[in-house]
C-alpha cells in the first residue's frame, strides 16, 4: 500500500495506526509533539520499507527505540528535504537508541540529530554506508558517548558479531543497538545492495531485496518503480512520479489536489508527472496536461479588489511578486525605507503591463523609477480626474524616471502629469513623452518646467577617461579635468564603482535617498595644479572581477537662479587582473583497490581567473596503530555515567583538567584561549542551530482550528 | 485531528436516488481532497468518487460514472454524494474520507475517516 501525500502525526500516540498497512510513505513521515509519555511496544510498522521524502522526530515523549516501530525502514529517499535533511530527530527526550537496523540507503540529503538527551548509538554508526556524503550531518547536544558506553552484540562475551569500518581515524564494530549489528554487503557487491544471507542483489535494486540479481525481488528501487519491476528509466508512455515509481498519462490526469491551483490538474513535463509547470513554463492552454516555455517571465495576472492598490511600503509590495500583469491602478507612496530600490525591483520587477493609471506622489525614498524595470505597457483604461494615467507629483528625491536608452514604454491611453519634482531634468520628462507616445497629448501646465528640476544640474557635460591601469585588486584611473564657466562652481569629484559581471548596469541601480546605493562612492579632491588630471586608486578589489565605474563632478546647483551645467561620465567597464585561485573544496579520496587511490574535489570557491589546470601532490603516510579508546571489561575504563540534559555546551571540566599543552613544558595547565576564528566559527554554529529551530518551528507549529 | 460524520443513508427502492451528506470539523476544509468509498457485507472497501479542494475536478469509480455526483460546500465544509438511479449493488455502507495535500487514483489509505452510513437499495 502506498500512503501520502506525506503523513504527520502529532498530539495523540493513536495516530500511529494510520501507518498500519503502509509499505511506502509516498511523501514525509512527521512524528511530532507527543507529549504524554506512553507504551510504544504495542506499536510496530513492519510493513514500512520506504519513504520518498525524510522522516522527521521531533518531542515524542516516551519513545525509546524506532527499531520496534520501523523494523523494516530501508531507504529514505530524500526526494524532498526538511531544511537539507534526510533525517531529523530533534529534542526526543527519551529516545535511547535510533534502532533503525535494517536502514541502509539514504539516497540525497544529509542527517540533523541533535538536542536528544539521552540518546546513545550514535558513533556505533557508519553513516558513510548509508549516505553518499556524511560531511553535512549534524550530530549535536545528544548523550556524550563516553557516558553511554555503547556496546555492540557480542563484544561483552569477546564473541563480537558485528562488523568493522573505520570512523575519524577509529576501527570499531558498527551496530544500532546492543542486539542489532549495522548490516554490511560483502566488498564483492560494491555499490549493490545485498539479502540477509550476504548475495548480491540486482544493480537496480536499493537498500536490499529478497533474492539475489532479481529486479522483481527489490526492498526499494535505485531508480524507478513500474509494474513490480525496478527499471532505470520509465518506459514509454510512463512518466516518473514523485521521484521514485513510472506512472501513465491516465493515473497523472486523475490526481486531485487540495491545493488552491488545482483546478487544472497535473501536468506532463520533460517526462515527469508534476502539480505545475516548472519555472519559465506555462500551460499549453488551460485544460492542457502540457508545458511550453514562456516568452520571457511567465505571465500571472493579478487584480486589487479596490481597483487602486497603494505601494507605501515593502509588505505592501510584497503582494505583487511575481506579478507580470497588474489588473488595477498603481499609486506609489514610498515616503522611507531601507534597501527600498532593491526591495521593489525584487517584488514589483516583473510587473510588464499596467491596466489602468500609475500615480507616484510623495515618494521621497525613491531616486528612480527602475524598479519597475519591465513595465512596458500603462494601458490607461481608468484615469485620474483630468485624464492623467501617468500622474508624478512632489517627488524630492526623484532624479531619474527609466534609463530611457534601454526601454520601451507604452501608454496608450490618457496624460502624463509631473510638478513639484525638484531633483527631475525637464529634459528626462521629454524624453518620456517621446518614447511612451504621449508627445502632444499634454497641455502646458501638465509638465511644469519651473519646479521641476529646479535643483538639478540638469544640463549635463560628458567626463571622459583619460588612463586606466589594473593589477589583481587595484584599479587607476584618471579623467579630463572638467573646466565649467566659473570654475568656483565645482567643488569635487565623486566616483561610483561596483561589481558588474555583465556590462547593463545604470547609475541609479539599487539606490534610494534614504542612504542605499549598490555603488560605492569615493570623494577625489580637485589637484591643485591646474595642469594635472584628477584620477583616483580603487584598491581592495576582488582580482579577476568586472567592475563598473563612473565619475560625477560635484557642482553648485543654482547661481541666482540660472540653471548651472554639470558633468559626468559614461559608465566604464574594467576588468581586474587574475591572480592565485583559493584551495580546492571537498577533498575526498578513497581506495578501490590495492594501488589505487580515487581523488575527487570541487572547484575553489574564488577561482580568480580562467581556471586551466589543477596540480595534485600525494605521499605516503604511517599507519595509525591506536585503534581502541575504551577496555570496557576494565571497570574503572567504563565513565560515570551522569544524565546529558540535551543542552549544546562545553563538557565539564574534572577538577585537574589535562587539557592540550601551552608552552613548552608538560603538565596540567588551563585550555589556550580560543582564537578569533574559532570563536567566530562558534558564533555561527549558534547562528546556524538558531536559524534551523527557527525554521523547525514555523515549519510545524499551525495554528489551532477555530 | 479532522473529525466526519456522514447522514443521508437509508432503503430505497431501485432506481431511486439519494443524497448523502458528511460533516467536517477541526481544520480547514479546502485544503482537503474529499472521497467517498463504499463496503458492501462480505467484500473489500472499494472507492466510489474524489473530490478536488476547490471543488473544481471529480474522479469517479467506472461502476458509478453517470449515476452518481459528487459536490462540496467549503463554506458549510460538507460533502455530497448524489446517487441516482439506484441498483440492489449499490447497496453497502459509505464512508466519507479526508487526505490531506492530494490524492493519487491508486491512494487508499486516506487520512481520516467517517463512521459510515448504510445505503440498502432494495424492493
Known amino acids: 500500500e502506498i500512503c501520502g501525500p506525506g503523513i504527520d502525526i502529532r498530539n495523540d500516540y493513536q495516530q500511529l495506526k494510520r501507518l498500519e498497512n503502509c509499505t511506502v510513505i509516498e511523501g514525509y513521515l512527521h512524528i511530532l509533539l507527543i507529549s504524554k509519555a506512553e507504551d510504544y511496544r504495542s506499536y510496530r510498522f513492519p510493513k514500512l520499507t520506504v519513504i520518498t521524502e525524510y522522516l522527521l522526530l521531533f518531542r515524542v515523549a516516551g519513545l525509546e527505540s524506532l527499531g520496534d516501530l520501523f523494523p523494516n525502514l530501508t531507504v529514505i529517499r530524500g526526494w524532498k528535504l526538511f531544511y537539507n535533511y534526510a533525517l531529523v530527530i530533534f529534542e526526543m527526550t527519551n529516545l535511547k537508541d535510533i534502532g533503525l537496523y535494517n536502514l541502509r540507503n539514504i539516497t540525497r540529503g544529509a542527517i540533523r540529530i541533535e538536542k536528544n538527551a539521552d540518546l546513545c548509538y550514535l558513533s556505533t554508526v557508519d553513516w558513510s554506508l548509508i549516505l553518499d556524503a556524511v560531511s553535512n550531518n549534524y550530530i549535536v547536544g545528544n548523550k556524550p558517548p563516553k557516558e553511554c558506553g555503547d556496546l555492540c552484540p557480542g563484544t561483552m562475551e569477546e564473541k563480537p558479531m558485528c562488523e568493522k569500518t573505520t570512523i575519524n581515524n577509529e576501527y570499531n564494530y558498527r551496530c544500532w543497538t546492543t542486539n542489532r549489528c549495522q548490516k554490511m554487503c560483502p566488498s564483492t557487491c560494491g555499490k549493490r545492495a545485498c539479502t540477509e544471507n550476504n548475495e548480491c542483489c540486482h544493480p537496480e535494486c536499493l537498500g536490499s531485496c529478497s533474492a539475489p540479481d532479481n529486479d522483481t525481488a527489490c526492498v526499494a528501487c535505485r531508480h524507478y518503480y513500474y509494474a513490480g519491476v525496478c527499471v532505470p528509466a520509465c518506459p514509454p508512455n510512463t512518466y516518473r512520479f514523485e521521484g521514485w515509481r513510472c506512472v501513465d498519462r491516465d493515473f497523472c490526469a486523475n490526481i486531485l489536489s487540495a491545493e488552491s491551483s488545482d483546478s487544472e490538474g497535473f501536468v506532463i513535463h520533460d517526462g515527469e508527472c508534476m502539480q505545475e509547470c516548472p519555472s519559465g513554463f506555462i500551460r499549453n492552454g488551460s485544460q492542457s496536461m502540457y508545458c511550453i516555455p514562456c516568452e520571457g517571465p511567465c505571465p500571472k495576472v493579478c487584480e486589487e479588489e479596490k481597483k487602486t492598490k497603494t505601494i507605501d511600503s515593502v509588505t505592501s509590495a510584497q503582494m505583487l511578486q511575481g506579478c507580470t500583469i497588474f489588473k488595477g491602478n498603481l499609486l506609489i507612496n514610498i515616503r522611507r525605507g531601507n534597501n527600498i530600490a532593491s526591495e521593489l525591483e525584487n517584488f514589483m520587477g516583473l510587473i510588464e503591463v499596467v491596466t489602468g493609471y500609475v500615480k507616484i506622489r510623495h515618494s521621497h525614498a525613491l531616486v528612480s523609477l527602475s524598479f519597475l524595470k519591465n513595465l512596458r505597457l500603462i494601458l490607461g483604461e481608468e484615469q485620474l480626474e483630468g485624464n492623467y494615467s501617468f500622474y508624478v507629483l512632489d517627488n524630492q528625491n526623484l532624479q531619474q524616471l527609466w534609463d530611457w536608452d534601454h526601454r520601451n514604454l507604452t501608454i496608450k491611453a490618457g496624460k502624463m502629469y509631473f510638478a513639484f519634482n525638484p531633483k527631475l531634468c525637464v529634459s528626462e520628462i521629454y524624453r518620456m513623452e517621446e518614447v511612451t507616445g504621449t508627445k502632444g497629448r499634454q497641455s502646458k501646465g501638465d509638465i511644469n518646467t519651473r519646479n521641476n528640476g529646479e535643483r538639478a544640474s540638469c544640463e549635463s557635460d560628458v567626463l571622459h577617461f583619460t588612463s586606466t591601469t589594473t593589477s589583481k585588486n587595484r584599479i587607476i584611473i584618471t579623467w579630463h579635468r572638467y573646466r565649467p564657466p566659473d570654475y568656483r562652481d565645482l567643488i569635487s569629484f565623486t566616483v561610483y564603482y561596483k561589481e558588474a559581471p555583465f556590462k547593463n548596469v545604470t547609475e541609479y541601480d539599487g539606490q534610494d535617498a534614504c542612504g542605499s546605493n549598490s555603488w560605492n562612492m569615493v570623494d577625489v579632491d580637485l589637484p591643485p595644479n591646474k595642469d594635472v588630471e584628477p584620477g583616483i586608486l580603487l584598491h581592495g578589489l576582488k582580482p579577476w572581477t568586472q567592475y563598473a565605474v563612473y565619475v560625477k563632478a560635484v557642482t553648485l546647483t543654482m547661481v541666482e537662479n540660472d540653471h548651472i551645467r554639470g558633468a559626468k561620465s559614461e559608465i566604464l567597464y574594467i576588468r581586474t587582473n587574475a591572480s592565485v585561485p583559493s584551495i580546492p573544496l571537498d577533498v575526498l579520496s578513497a581506495s578501490n583497490s590495492s594501488s589505487q587511490l580515487i581523488v575527487k574535489w570541487n572547484p575553489p570557491s574564488l577561482p580568480n581567473g580562467n581556471l586551466s589546470y589543477y596540480i595534485v601532490r600525494w605521499q605516503r603516510q604511517p599507519q595509525d596503530g591506536y585503534l581502541y579508546r575504551h577496555n570496557y571489561c576494565s571497570k574503572d575504563k567504563i565513565p560515570i555515567r551522569k544524565y546529558a540534559d540535551g543542552t549544546i555546551d562545553i563538557e565539564e571540566v574534572t577538577e585537574n583538567p589535562k587539557t592540550e599543552v601551552c608552552g613548552g613544558e608538560k603538565g596540567p595547565c588551563c585550555a589556550c584561549p580560543k582564537t578569533e576564528a574559532e570563536k567566530q566559527a562558534e558564533k555561527e554554529e549558534a547562528e546556524y542551530r538558531k536559524v534551523f529551530e527557527n525554521f523547525l518551528h514555523n515549519s510545524i507549529f499551525v495554528p489551532r482550528p477555530e | 485531528e479532522v473529525q466526519l460524520v456522514e447522514s443521508g443513508g437509508g432503503l430505497v427502492q431501485p432506481g431511486g436516488s439519494l443524497r448523502l451528506s458528511c460533516a467536517a470539523s477541526g481544520r480547514t476544509f479546502s485544503s482537503f481532497v474529499m472521497s467517498w468509498f463504499r463496503q458492501a457485507p462480505g467484500k473489500e472497501r472499494e472507492f466510489v468518487s474524489a473530490i478536488s479542494g476547490s471543488g473544481s475536478r471529480m474522479r469517479y469509480a467506472d461502476s458509478v460514472k453517470g449515476r452518481f455526483t459528487i459536490s462540496r460546500d467549503n463554506s458549510k465544509n460538507t460533502l455530497y454524494l448524489q446517487m441516482n438511479s439506484l441498483r440492489a449493488e449499490d447497496t453497502a455502507v459509505y464512508y466519507c474520507?479526508?487526505?490531506?495535500?492530494?490524492?493519487?487514483?491508486?491512494?487508499?489509505?486516506?487520512?481520516?475517516w467517517g463512521q459510515g452510513t448504510l445505503v440498502t437499495v432494495s424492493s
Open positions: 474520507a479526508a487526505n490531506p495535500r492530494r490524492a493519487t487514483p491508486d491512494l487508499t489509505q486516506y487520512a481520516y
